[in-house]
Amino acid sequence: HTAAQDNCTCPTNKMTVCSPDGPGGRCQCRALGSGMAVDCSTLTSKCLLLKARMSAPKNARTLVRPSEHALVDNDGLYDPDCDPEGRFKARQCNQTSVCWCVNSVGVRRTDKGDLSLRCDELVRTHHILIDLRHRPTAGAFNHSDLDAELRRLFRERYRLHPKFVAAVHYEQPTIQIELRQNTSQKAAGDVDIGDAAYYFERDIKGESLFQGRGGLDLRVRGEPLQVERTLIYYLDEIPPKFSMKRLTA
C-alpha cells in the first residue's frame, strides 16, 4: 500500500499544491509559480523549483581543479522561463529586457544583452563538480566509506543512476563529488545531474525540497557529516561565451 495518495502530497517536492482531481480521483500535484503538473515519483526540474521559489514568500536565506571553462552560479536567484517539459529556456530575460543565455542547469553562460540576443540551443551541462568542506571531526573519514555513502545517497535519495557519479575525492576537510552525464548517456526517465545536484545543494544548506519533516541526516559509519561550505562548478558540452572584459575583471 502507498500512503502518498491518502495524504495527497508530493514526497519529492514540498513547493507544490496537490488535490485529488487527477484521473479516477488520483492525487495530482502542480508546482507553485508555474502551475505545471509534476511527477512526484521523481525529482522536479530545477527550472520549476526556481520558479516556485521565486513565487513563494521570501525568507531570510585527490582533488580536482575546475577547468578554465567551469561556471559558478554567481548571479543567484532569478525567475526563470521554463519550457513545457520544465527545462530552462535557452534565453532568459528579466523585467527590464536584459537577456542572457543559460545552460541546462540555468546558469548564465554569456554576457548580458538586450532582446536581440540569440541563444540558438540549450547547451547541456555534462559535468558538475560539487566541492564541499566538512566541519572538523575527531579524525578523517575513511575514504572508501565516504565514497560508498555519498554514492548511496545520490542513488537512494536523489534517484540518480550510479553510473552518473563519476568520482568522489577526499582530502580532509575537502570532499569533491563529480557528476557526469552526456546527452547520449541520459535515457528517458533518468534523473538529470543538474536536478540531483540542486536537491543535494539545498539539502546540505538545510533547505530540503522534499516533503519530509527533518531534512538530510548524512552519516558515515554513524559519524555525522556536516558541511560548512559548498561550491558547485558547472562544465558545459560547449564552452561558455564571455567577453574578455569579464574574464579579466
Epitope: 500512503a3 502518498a4 495524504n7 502530497t9 514526497p11 545517497l153 537512494e156 541526516d217
Partner: nanobody, 126 residues
Framework: QVQLLESGGGLVQPGGSLRLSCAAS????????MGWLRQAPGKERELVAS????????YYADSVKGRFTISRDNSKNTLYLQMNSLRAEDTAVYYC???????????????????WGQGTLVTVSS
C-alpha cells in the same frame, strides 16, 4: 518498493509480553526511517513507535511510553517492537511501515510513511 512482512503477533494475557518482528526486502532498509502502526477495530490507524534510519532518534505514543521499545538491526534488515505490560486496549492489528524518503533526520510521523505490510494481530485478553 520495499516489501515488509510482520510476525510475532498472537494471543497474550494482560501484563504479558510479545516481540514483533518485521523483515524488509526489495529496497535498502538501512537508510529509511521505520515505524510500527496499529489499528484497533473501528478506530483510526495510529503511530505507536518510530525510529530514524540511523537509530539516533525514536518516538513513542504517550499510551505506550515506558512499555514498548522499538529497535532495528540494519545488518538483518529487521525492525522490532518489544511490547511489555500489555493491556486490553493494545489489542489491534500491528503494521510495520517504511518511510518514503531515505536519509531523513528525526523520527518519522504517520504521514511520512509510504508503505506498510499486511499486519499481525495482537490480542490481549484473559
Amino acid at each position: 518498493q520495499v516489501q515488509l512482512l510482520e510476525s510475532g503477533g498472537g494471543l497474550v494475557q494482560p501484563g504479558g509480553s510479545l516481540r514483533l518482528s518485521c523483515a524488509a526486502s526489495g529496497r535498502s532498509f538501512s537508510r529509511y526511517g521505520m515505524g510500527w502502526l496499529r489499528q484497533a477495530p473501528g478506530k483510526e490507524r495510529e503511530l505507536v513507535a518510530s525510529i530514524s534510519w540511523s537509530g539516533h532518534s525514536t518516538y513513542y505514543a504517550d499510551s505506550v511510553k515506558g512499555r514498548f521499545t522499538i529497535s532495528r538491526d540494519n545488518s538483518k534488515n529487521t525492525l522490532y517492537l518489544q511490547m511489555n505490560s500489555l493491556r486490553a486496549e493494545d489489542t489491534a492489528v500491528y503494521y510495520c511501515a517504511a518511510e518514503s524518503l531515505p536519509y531523513e533526520s528525526g523520527s518519522p510521523r504517520l504521514t511520512d510513511f509510504a508503505s506498510w505490510g499486511q499486519g499481525t494481530l495482537v490480542t490481549v485478553s484473559s
